[in-house]
Interface confidence: medium
């Protein structure tokens, strides 16, 4: 379920843009990076696609947003929220957040200046 973010003006169009793109490759790419070749890998249904392929698809998706730079934080927050329940412990949560904040740079975008990834009612 999507969070009610309660913001006004431009950010609502960011929400629409984030909703229109497919964040799954980004989620899978980060999971691949933090899971390595562990057995749990299977449960993420991602072994069929190489991490570099997922990264390229992820960057393509982020690039689809009309205002990629301005809406980047929203996209990162949504990725965090989508994967929150699959992160098994605090260490994994922190790893995921670290990789997530590196994502814009991997895609040759500027990282958002301030982006609070503490989403999902404190679960993550």
């Amino acid at each position: 379920m999507r969070r009610e973010r309660g913001r006004q003006g431009d950010s609502s169009s960011c929400e629409r843009q984030v909703d229109r793109v497919n964040l799954k490759p980004c989620e899978q790419h980060i999971m691949q990076r933090i899971m390595g070749e562990q057995e749990q890998y299977d449960s993420y249904d991602i072994r069929s696609t190489r991490s570099s392929d997922q990264q390229q698809r992820c960057c393509d998706e982020l690039n689809e947003m009309e205002n990629t730079q301005r809406c980047m934080c929203e996209a990162l927050q949504q990725i965090m929220e989508n994967q929150c329940d699959r992160l098994q412990d605090r260490q994994m949560v922190q790893q995921f957040k670290r990789e997530l904040m590196n994502l814009p740079q991997q895609c040759n975008f500027r990282a958002p200046q301030r982006c609070d990834l503490d989403v999902s009612g404190g679960r993550c």
Epitope: R20, N22, K24, Q28, S48, T49, D60, N63, E64, E66
Partner: antibody
Framework: EVQLVESGGGLVRPGGSLRLSCVAS????????MHWVRQAPGKGLLWVSS????????TYADSVKGRFTISRDNTNNTLFLQLDSLRAEDTAVYYC???????????????WGRGTLVTVSS | DIVMTQSPESLAVSLGERATINCKSS??????LGWYQQRPGQPPKLLIY???KRESGVPDRFSGSGSGTDFTLTIGRLQAEDVAVYYC??????????FGGGTKVEIK
């Protein structure tokens, strides 16, 4: 109103040619990838060709490669499909289709014209 | 090219009942799948994209699910206006995108 209107279909003999046109209105044509999809009578859908926003990267289904040419005129909001060396199996309704995507190609299609019928028969 | 296989080819369902259409891809396509409705004499209309996202204006009785190679379109309570042919489409490899063969939904 947001719409696509095709024209140029008709009856043509095998080996003949036709030029299909599609006029777009109600949206900013030059910001969208565009495609042609065809449907033979009573059959399913087959992607034929696509073209990026500035018209520089045409792609084609193997079955039409070398015979069909896609192009666009962004000034007049028009997409074209030149059909040459036509065969009986090219008989179909040809739909002009807008891609939802802006940057990458051939994703899903959120706006369809009503189609124009091409009949290839001797 | 990735082959999309739909089942069943046709389906007769009573008004108000649930209709379920399946689509299987010949290889993994993650969630790069759309569903279209084509009513008689009309062009196709986008219903679902990214396997499960409903297009704006599409009634919520239509829902999509699945990932990888197996996908489902469900019409929760069939209405008379839902009589149509439904197509799935993969866009994981593009071009070419490929469509399933279609499933005809009729009233029982």
């Amino acid at each position: 109103e947001v719409q696509l209107v095709e024209s140029g279909g008709g009856l043509v003999r095998p080996g003949g040619s036709l030029r299909l046109s599609c006029v777009a209105s109600g949206f900013t044509f030059n910001t969208y990838w565009m495609h042609w999809v065809r449907q033979a009578p009573g059959k399913g859908l087959l992607w034929v060709s696509s073209l990026n926003k500035d018209g520089s990267s045409p792609t084609y289904a193997d079955s039409v490669k070398g015979r069909f040419t896609i192009s666009r005129d962004n000034t007049n909001n028009t997409l074209f499909l030149q059909l040459d060396s036509l065969r009986a199996e090219d008989t179909a309704v040809y739909y002009c289709v807008r891609d939802r995507r802006a940057v990458t190609t051939a994703r899903y299609f959120d706006l369809w014209g009503r189609g124009t019928l091409v009949t290839v028969s001797s | 090219d990735i082959v999309m296989t739909q089942s069943p080819e046709s389906l007769a369902v009573s008004l108000g009942e649930r209709a379920t259409i399946n689509c299987k891809s010949s290889s993994n396509i993650d969630n790069y799948l759309g569903w279209y409705q084509q009513r008689p004499g009309q062009p196709p209309k986008l219903l679902i994209y990214w396997a499960s996202k409903r297009e704006s204006g599409v009634p919520d009785r239509f829902s999509g699910s699945g990932s990888g190679t197996d996908f489902t379109l469900t019409i929760g309570r069939l209405q008379a206006e839902d009589v149509a042919v439904y197509y799935c489409q993969q866009y994981y490899t593009s071009p070419p995108v490929t469509f399933g063969g279609g499933t005809k939904v009729e009233i029982k």
